[in-house]
Structures are given as C-alpha cells and as structure tokens.
C-alpha cells in the first residue's frame, strides 16, 4: 500500500512585509496516527511555528477549520510578516508514541522571501 | 459502514482466541482501528488502535493481545493470548475518525463479540 | 493517564424533561472530548466531537459544551429512545484513550 507522503507545493513564497503568507502543506493518508507540526529550518536548532495540541501561536492560523473531519489539508497562514520569518518553513508528520512521538515524515520545504513594503 | 466481530467463545484461563472484524462501506485501508471492550455491566475500556504500521495498547493487555489488519480483505484482527478471567467482555470493532489536527475518536462500531474467560 | 469522571452516575427524569450531565477531566483536554450513547443490548453510538458538533443524524435535541476540563451533554426534552448511558471519551492525550465511568439516564 502507499506510505502517506506530505505534499509541499511551493518550493518558495514571496510576501511584503506586513501582509500574511499562507504555507500549503496536504498528507496523502490519515494513518499512521500522529500529530503534525510546522518548523522553520531543520536539525536540532529548528524553530516551531505551529503545533495545534499544545503552544500559543498568535499569528498563525490554520487554513482548514480545526473542526474538520479527517482533514488532510495542514496548511497555515502567518499574519504581519517581517524580515525576521523568512527562511524553509517544513510540514512535518509524527508518528503516534508514548510517551514521546516520532518524527515520521517530512515535506521538502517551503522557502519564505519577504519583500519591503510598498511605499 | 458496516462492522461485524466474530471469533468470541468461551476460553479457558491461560487460553488463546483471534477476533476478526470484517469491515465495509468505507475506504478501510485510510483509516485506523480500534478494539474496545467491556465487561459485563461495566463501562467502556479501551483495547487497541492500528494505524499502518502503527499499534498501540492499553496497559493491561499488552504483551498478550496483538492487533493486526489485512487491507486486501478490509479485515481488522485481535489476537488474544494468555486469556484471564478479567478480560471476559464484549469486544467491539471501532473505525477512527479524526478532527483536524487532533486525536481519534470512534464513528462507527460494531455490535460485539463476547469473550468469556472461565475455567 | 487522563481520568474521565462523570456525574451523576444515574440521573431519572420524566419524558419530555430536560437532561443535563457532565464530564470532568483530571487535566486539559482542550476540545478534544467526544459523547457517546449506548442502549441497552447495543453498541455505543457517537453522538458529539470535537466537545460540542454533533455527529451526522443526531438530533437537536442533543448538545455539547465545555472545554479544558468541564463539560456537559444536555438533552432537551427527552425523548423514549433517550434512556441509555452515556459515556464521554477524551482523545487530546493518548495512549490510553480514556472513557468515563458512565451516566445512566432512567425513567422518573
């Protein structure tokens, strides 16, 4: 059967400062059963964007309703965006474990440029 | 949806036992599973989930009871060894549906099979 | 492991009243909290998610509401087919799920 892949679209996405950036992200299967996560960079040093379970993440929204049945759609937007966020931006699928999950997979990134604001 | 158990009987303590549930009306293999139990009388206890590859169990019954599934026959399994006398219950088969970016919950059971563990 | 409580464990009303019951949880489950009926003889049937969306088909009748650790299943105007027991699931933190102890809704 098919492992479940996780589908970036984009390689990049450019955004003016300011405005909101939307990070497409889909799986390709519910199963195996698990969490996903939104990091910025990769390796030890990663910084989380977004994980729905626990964390408060003010400027980040989730594109499909957090009430959706058997949603695959993982995309996210991040409003006010500066400088400061551009980078590879990574969907990533856990796998289920006890007491910690386990990195299952990841999608190949999305690079995020922002723009000066228009003057 | 249709679910259906099957494999409940009488055991002998120390005895072995393979439920089959044999699932329908939906997309079996994109989904995971679950066995849920309970006892004469008694509340709801969870067994366990399958999702790919992926199984998880309750305390007390792991190490004996083994899950497993066949997509080509849109089958769910529980092997049950080393029965004991608390494990007599009604086991039901349970589809996962899941919300979003959160846990599983159970749309769909079965109407049971009973397993009765006596001497 | 996240323990379920619900109260009362038996609750007799007339046809035609007004149920109300409740789930505790032993810590924040957020939303992540299901209902389920089961009828005598039957299996169990899955009434709301998500703490409060009723399920395809549920009457409306039936209602959720709570989040974190509080919650409650009401049901207005209770119907025949209504007597049953009802069962809260949490699913933001597992393995184990975790079900409650059960609230047994009997005819007054």
């Known amino acids: 059967e098919d492992e479940l892949q996780v589908i970036q679209p984009e390689k990049s996405v450019s955004v003016a400062a300011g405005e909101s950036a939307t990070l497409r992200c889909a799986m390709t299967s519910l199963i195996p059963v698990g969490p996903i996560m939104w990091f910025r960079g990769a390796g030890a040093g990663r910084e989380l964007i977004y994980n729905q379970k626990e964390g408060h993440f003010p400027r980040v929204t989730t594109v499909s309703e957090l009430t959706k049945r058997n949603n695959l759609d993982f995309s996210i937007s991040i409003s006010n965006i500066t400088p400061a966020d551009a980078g590879t931006y990574y969907c990533v699928k856990f796998r289920k474990g006890s007491p910690d999950d386990v990195e299952f997979k990841s999608g190949a990134g999305t690079e995020l440029s922002v723009r000066a604001k228009p003057s | 949806v249709q679910l259906v158990e099957s494999g409940g009987g009488v055991v002998q303590p120390g005895g072995s036992l393979r439920l089959s549930c044999a699932a329908s009306g939906f997309s079996f293999s994109n989904f995971a599973m679950t066995w849920v139990r309970q006892a004469p009388g008694e509340g709801l206890e969870w067994v366990s989930t399958i999702g790919s590859g992926d199984t998880y169990y309750a305390d007390s019954v792991k190490g004996r009871f083994t899950i497993s599934r066949d997509n080509s026959k849109n089958t769910l399994y529980l092997q049950m060894n080393s029965l004991r006398a608390e494990d007599t219950a009604v086991y039901y088969c349970a589809k996962d549906s899941t919300v979003s970016w959160s846990g599983d919950f159970f749309d769909y059971w079965g109407l049971g099979t009973l397993v009765t563990v006596s001497s | 492991e996240i323990v379920l409580t619900q109260s009362p464990a038996t609750l007799s009303v007339s046809p035609g009243e007004r149920a109300t019951f409740s789930c505790r949880a032993s810590q924040n489950v957020k939303n992540d909290l299901a209902w389920y009926q089961q009828r005598p003889g039957q299996a169990p049937r899955l009434l709301i998610y998500?703490?409060?969306i009723r399920e395809t088909g549920i009457p409306e009748r039936f209602s959720g509401s709570g989040s974190g650790t509080e919650f409650t299943l009401t049901i207005t105007s209770l119907q025949s087919e209504d007597f049953a027991v009802y069962y809260c699931?949490?699913?933001?933190?597992?393995?184990?799920?975790?079900f409650g102890g059960g609230t047994k809704v009997e005819i007054k």
């Open positions: 699931q949490q699913y933001y933190d597992w393995p184990p799920f975790t």
């Open positions: 998500a703490a409060r």
